[in-house]
């Protein structure tokens, strides 16, 4: 019996067709991507195969402004267009409260959500009863296939759940619930959901009984053959994990963004084993055209953005400086109202020992793209931040060795007075630098806040203890020279859309006056 | 879709003037710094200068510095060439181009400016 | 300034060849370097930066190395359309070009 699996994972908003790095699209006949081109690929697959499921691994929402103006409701209406068989719950998913998921997702959603490793705890436990579940058994033509979801056990530092949401670790709970459908004689099981790929692996290694592992959380891209386009494969599509009783499962992601649709097919005997697997993303490119009537239905609800996007978020009785004489060459205002909105976008009172998980923040001031003069009767919208935060960036967080983070303040003013990018605006850390001494030893001050302490307040960077940095994903990439990072960090989850994170900090401070205030110091 | 027309080339005498100009579409030009870049006939290319998304900083090559003026205006998605006393080696096709060697690079198709007598 | 040296400044070769096409700079520059292919009467096109990124839409047989002082650009199976000039460029200080390498058919 043969099964076709299509997936996505980690489309974070991209309803609408993207450039092929997954920004706005700019030149539409070389774009990628978006719901109508997928809806076109699946129905094609549909119409040609007998047995197919349509998965999505999470981290639907977070990441354009669709999701900052329709808070999930899109992601529920265009998956339903698109009939998808399964979603796992991301870590996104709760980036607006557990309400902001019930309400315009679990309810609105006709396709089961799932997740093993999240339960519901005191008034929340009967309230989202029912609404997402560990498993699913789902009728595929004259079969039947289970389908278990999981998510990220760290979503408590990536997001918001809540304090009445406990995450399990996942392998531990999975095993049961496999073990049930088990019991239930349903023999060809597929592990859903979004840990990120070595997670994924680890499940396809230790709990028994999973047949296939479809992840997220980690962008990975997997390929057999010559990629399509720019992205890197991490492996072989599919990944095969030789699990601890000696089967061979399958692991498969579909990288992110909806550039790819992953395509797998499975043949099992009449036991329930996979006697083969092969497939490969399908790259959505232009080639495919895009469904005219989901597209005209994505035209419909664009109307409502181009309103937002010229309404007023907040106010600032100060001159926003965002410009390059500053924000390259020394503290600007601008760099220190971001880098503040991102520390606050990451408030998780998660330990008493700690005030937050993480209190720092760096940021490359060629990022800083516009001023906003507060002239203008101090109106901030999200055009004029659209202009300050240009590139369609994510704010993420990553874990650094103090070492690494001393390398990057050596690299941010290495080649100092032209102008160039490197330069880092910065919270909760103070940096002092001395120009007169050679590149790479100009760093003679470094002090960071504390994290656990209940004062916060400013100690020497240790160079062995490992910190958690909130930073633009194009610095955790290594963009602007910063290769120290991307080469020596620890740990990296990716966070939510630059432009929302600063909308929703001055929104919610309503009036803003950062100031210059000694953060970066010249010796 | 991303656009950069060159205008304002043509023939000067050696020690004339002449004005280039750059007019962008399809992209929020006041988000980018700009650049000039040039190539003689038959030659490499050769950087000219280079402006910032808000025009607070400019920096030229050391061939051009003194004589020629990179300027913009944002409001009107443009960017410009002053280049007084032209000698014949600034004899090329000028191009304009978005943030070279990033991300964000784009080109113009050229305009050639000859200087002679 | 910093000064870029290409080599060989011309090269003959064939489809399906695999190409290497080498800049060197005077001094070192980290990894701002960049590599671009122009067509004659066209503008150039960017195909590599930060030495290694390949830009949107550049296939995946153009590849870049290198940090430092010493860069490559490599093309894995030479396409028809790949014949061209190709220039490699720093931007540590204020940007400079190497003098070009002309790539033709054999």
């Known amino acids: 019996w043969e099964l076709t699996i299509l997936h996505t994972n980690d489309v974070h908003s991209r309803l609408e067709q993207t450039s092929e790095d997954s920004s706005k699209c700019v030149n539409a006949s070389r774009c990628m991507g978006g719901v109508a081109r997928l809806f076109t690929k699946v129905q094609q697959i549909r119409r040609a195969e007998p047995n197919v499921l349509l998965l999505d691994a999470g981290d639907q929402y977070q990441g354009t402004i669709w999701f900052t103006v329709y808070k999930g409701a899109e992601v529920a209406h265009f998956m339903n267009a698109l009939r998808y068989d399964a979603m796992a719950l991301g870590n996104h998913e709760f980036d607006n409260g557990v309400e902001g998921l019930i309400e315009p997702l679990l309810k609105e959603a006709k396709f089961p959500i799932l997740s093993a490793n999240i339960k519901a705890k005191g008034p929340l436990a009967s309230q989202i009863s029912g609404l997402y579940l560990p498993y699913k058994v789902l009728p595929v033509g004259d079969e039947v296939v289970g389908i278990v979801g999981y998510t990220s056990k760290e979503t408590p530092f990536l997001s918001n759940p809540g304090t009445n949401l406990v995450f399990e670790d996942e392998i531990t709970a999975l095993q049961p619930e496999v073990d049930k459908l088990k019991t239930l004689n349903v023999n060809k099981i597929i592990a859903l959901g979004h840990s990120g790929f070595e997670m994924d692996k680890l499940i396809a290694q230790k709990v028994r009984g999973v047949d296939v592992v479809v992840g997220g959380h980690s962008n990975t891209f997997l390929y057999t053959g010559n990629p399509p386009s720019k992205e890197v494969p991490a492996g072989k599509y599919p990944f095969i994990v030789t699990s601890d009783d000696g089967r061979k499962v399958p692991v498969v992601q579909a990288y992110a963004f909806g550039k790819y649709l992953g395509y797998l097919k499975i043949e099992f005997d009449e036991r329930g084993n996979v006697i083969s697997s092969h497939g490969n993303p399908i790259l959505l490119n232009s080639s495919i055209p895009e469904d005219p009537s989901i597209k005209a239905d994505i035209n419909k609800w664009r109307i409502k953005l181009d309103n937002y996007s010229t309404q007023e978020l907040g106010k600032t009785i100060v001159y926003l400086d965002g410009s390059s004489q500053s924000c390259r060459f020394r503290e600007c205002n601008m760099g220190n109202l971001i880098c503040d909105a991102m520390i606050n976008n990451n408030l998780r009172h998660t330990d008493e020992m700690f005030w937050n998980h993480v209190s720092m923040c760096i940021l490359n001031g060629g990022g800083i793209r516009s001023p906003i003069d507060e002239r203008n009767n101090g109106t901030i919208t999200w055009e004029n931040l659209a202009a300050v935060l240009p590139f369609g960036g994510t704010f993420d967080l990553v874990q650094l060795k103090g070492s690494t983070l001393k390398k990057a303040f050596e690299h941010s003013v290495h080649r100092y007075g032209q102008s160039t990018g490197e330069f880092l605006q910065v919270g909760g850390i103070h940096v002092v630098y001395d120009l007169s001494r050679k590149p790479g030893d100009r760093v003679v001050k470094l002090d960071v806040l504390c994290t656990k302490c209940r004062v916060p307040s400013y100690d020497p960077l240790k160079m062995d203890e490992v910190y958690k940095v909130i930073l633009p994903n194009f610095l955790a990439n290594g963009g602007d020279g910063f290769q120290m990072i991307k080469d020596e960090l620890l740990r990296h989850d990716s966070g939510d859309q630059d432009i929302n994170v600063v909308s929703t900090y001055i929104s919610k401070m309503k009036v803003i006056y950062p100031a210059v205030e000694g953060r970066i110091k010249f010796s | 879709e991303v656009q950069l027309v060159e205008s304002g080339g043509g023939l000067v005498q050696p020690g004339g003037s002449l004005r280039l100009s750059c007019a962008a579409s399809?992209?929020?030009?006041?988000?980018?710094?700009m650049h000039w870049v040039r190539q003689a006939p038959g030659k490499g290319l050769e950087w000219v200068a280079v402006?910032?998304?808000?025009?607070?900083?400019?920096y030229y090559a050391d061939s051009v510095k003194g004589r020629f003026t990179i300027s913009r205006d944002n409001s009107k998605n443009a960017l410009y060439l002053q280049m007084n006393s032209l000698r014949a080696e600034d004899t090329a096709v000028y191009y304009c181009?978005?943030?070279?060697?990033?991300?964000?690079?784009?080109w113009g198709q050229g305009t050639l400016v000859t200087v002679s007598s | 300034a910093i000064q870029m040296t290409q080599s060989p400044s011309s090269l003959s070769a064939s489809v399906g060849d695999r190409v290497t096409i080498t800049c060197r700079a005077s001094?070192?520059?980290?990894?701002?370097l960049a590599w671009y292919q122009q067509k004659p009467g066209k503008a150039p096109k960017l195909l590599i930066y930060?030495?290694?990124t390949l830009q949107s839409g550049v296939p995946s047989r153009f590849s870049g190395s290198g940090s430092g002082t010493d860069f490559t650009l490599t093309i894995s199976s030479l396409q028809p359309e790949d014949f061209a000039t190709y220039y490699c460029?720093?931007?540590?200080?204020?940007?400079?070009f190497g003098q070009g390498t002309r790539l033709e058919i054999k």
């Open positions: 399809g992209f929020t030009f006041s988000s980018y710094d």
């Open positions: 181009a978005t943030e070279i060697a990033a991300k964000g690079d784009y």
């Open positions: 402006m910032s998304y808000d025009g607070s900083n400019k």
């Open positions: 930060a030495a290694s």
């Open positions: 460029q720093q931007s540590y200080s204020t940007p400079h």
């Open positions: 001094q070192g520059i980290s990894n701002y």
